[in-house]
Amino acid sequence: QLPPGKPEIFKCRSPNKETFTCWWRPGTDGGLPTNYSLTYHREGETLMHECPDYITGGPNSCHFGKQYTSMWRTYIMMVNATNQMGSSFSDELYVDVTYIVQPDPPLELAVEVKQPEDRKPYLWIKWSPPTLIDLKTGWFTLLYEIRLKPEKAAEWEIHFAGQQTEFKILSLHPGQKYLVQVRCKPDHGYWSAWSPATFIQIPSDFTMND
């Protein structure tokens, strides 16, 4: 029977700069029941605080709701593991909410084959930003990436769409069924997961020539 091993805060993520969650990996438990607590203070503050919500983010997590989240402050946090034989502390982690944003995937992905009479046919892809992101405030710039592939292909073709929420693709294989997905990323932060795939059948008479 031993004191607990050193825990590690391995990830903090925010969906929108308004809330965030951090997760830790427990160390060894020393063969005894072990309690974990996350404590933090903010830059310029010596008063310590405890995690306000150990439930929302699941096991070994701390969730900071709106009233505990500030974009303008660095959080300095650590996890304490305690059992009957003693305690151990994680290294301090410095968290700036601006840099940990991982949005939800974009929504309402729509894909359509357009075949104008006077121009080359193309695949038209359109989507909406994730609900939790308020682009009107100017706090956010979202960048988008599209990937697509024929249903049975192994390799994805990736296109960077910048800040626009629609995109045209000209080069496609006629007669193939394609999977299309989109994801987004804030200017500072992490790519979202890919949106659920949308399928589109490319007509056999779709011409690929440039």
Epitope: S37, T39, G44, E45, L47, P52, D53, S70
Partner: antibody, heavy 118, light 107 residues
Framework: EVHLVESGGGLVQPGGSLRLSCAAS????????MNWVRQTPGKGLEWISH????????YYADSVKGRFTISRDNAKNSLFLQMNSLRAEDTAVYFC???????????WGQGTLVTVSS | EIVLTQSPATLSLSPGERATLSCRAS??????FAWYQQKPGQAPRLLIY???SRATGIPTRFSGSGSGTDFTLTISSLEPEDFAVYYC?????????FGQGTRLEIK
């Protein structure tokens, strides 16, 4: 609607004890840092104790350290202050305060009067 | 402990006038700073937190400014219900401390 209701105040002799309670409703008590603040005509407002969501972090003012004990029961949405070895200078209105925004108490009870006198 | 000194101790003004209350900290508190209003027989009411953010339900005539050691609460145009005692508070470090209060009275 948020309610914080203090009870347990009263008249006590110097050296005596009292246990104050604060019943909370209308918010997720278990997530909030809680505090006891007192107010005397002479000293104004004095923050005397602070307890974190799961009682991991506890602070006391030097004036009450070793005599007062703060505790909470999240299952019962209750905050407590055990006051021992009471002195005349502990006479005050005692407020419980719930922290909601970055450690600023936005919710206060109406207070309970503690009078220490022989 | 961090000592907060409020000035003036009493401020006599008329409704419609602008009120400026000051608070100085004995050492830097960054912007972990608040202003409260208290009326007789009531608990203090949070007006401003983080030096300049208005608490929920507080009218826009109340504004806070400052960081470090010097802070100001401004009431742009006094309403009759604003006459009360105002306290500043720091919560950068323990013990959390209050100023001694400024009494805002009707002239």
């Amino acid at each position: 609607e948020v309610h914080l209701v203090e009870s347990g105040g009263g008249l006590v002799q110097p050296g005596g004890s009292l246990r104050l309670s604060c019943a909370a409703s209308g918010f997720t008590f278990s997530s909030y840092e809680m505090n006891w603040v007192r107010q005397t005509p002479g000293k104004g407002l004095e923050w005397i104790s602070h307890i974190s969501s799961r009682s991991v972090i506890i602070y006391y003012a030097d004036s009450v350290k070793g005599r007062f004990t703060i505790s909470r029961d999240n299952a019962k949405n209750s905050l407590f202050l055990q006051m021992n070895s009471l002195r005349a200078e502990d006479t005050a209105v005692y407020f419980c305060a719930g922290i909601t925004i970055f450690g600023i108490p936005e919710y206060w009870g109406q207070g309970t009067l503690v009078t220490v006198s022989s | 402990e961090i000592v907060l000194t409020q000035s003036p101790a009493t401020l006599s003004l008329s409704p419609g006038e602008r009120a400026t209350l000051s608070c100085r900290a004995s050492q830097s508190v960054s912007s972990y700073f608040a202003w409260y209003q208290q009326k007789p027989g009531q608990a203090p009411r949070l007006l401003i937190y983080d030096a300049s953010s208005r608490a929920t339900g507080i009218p826009t005539r109340f504004s806070g400014s400052g960081s470090g050691t010097d802070f100001t609460l401004t009431i742009s145009s006094l309403e009759p219900e604003d006459f009360a005692v105002y306290y500043c508070q720091q919560r950068s470090s323990w013990p959390i401390t209050f100023g001694q209060g400024t009494r805002l009275e009707i002239k």
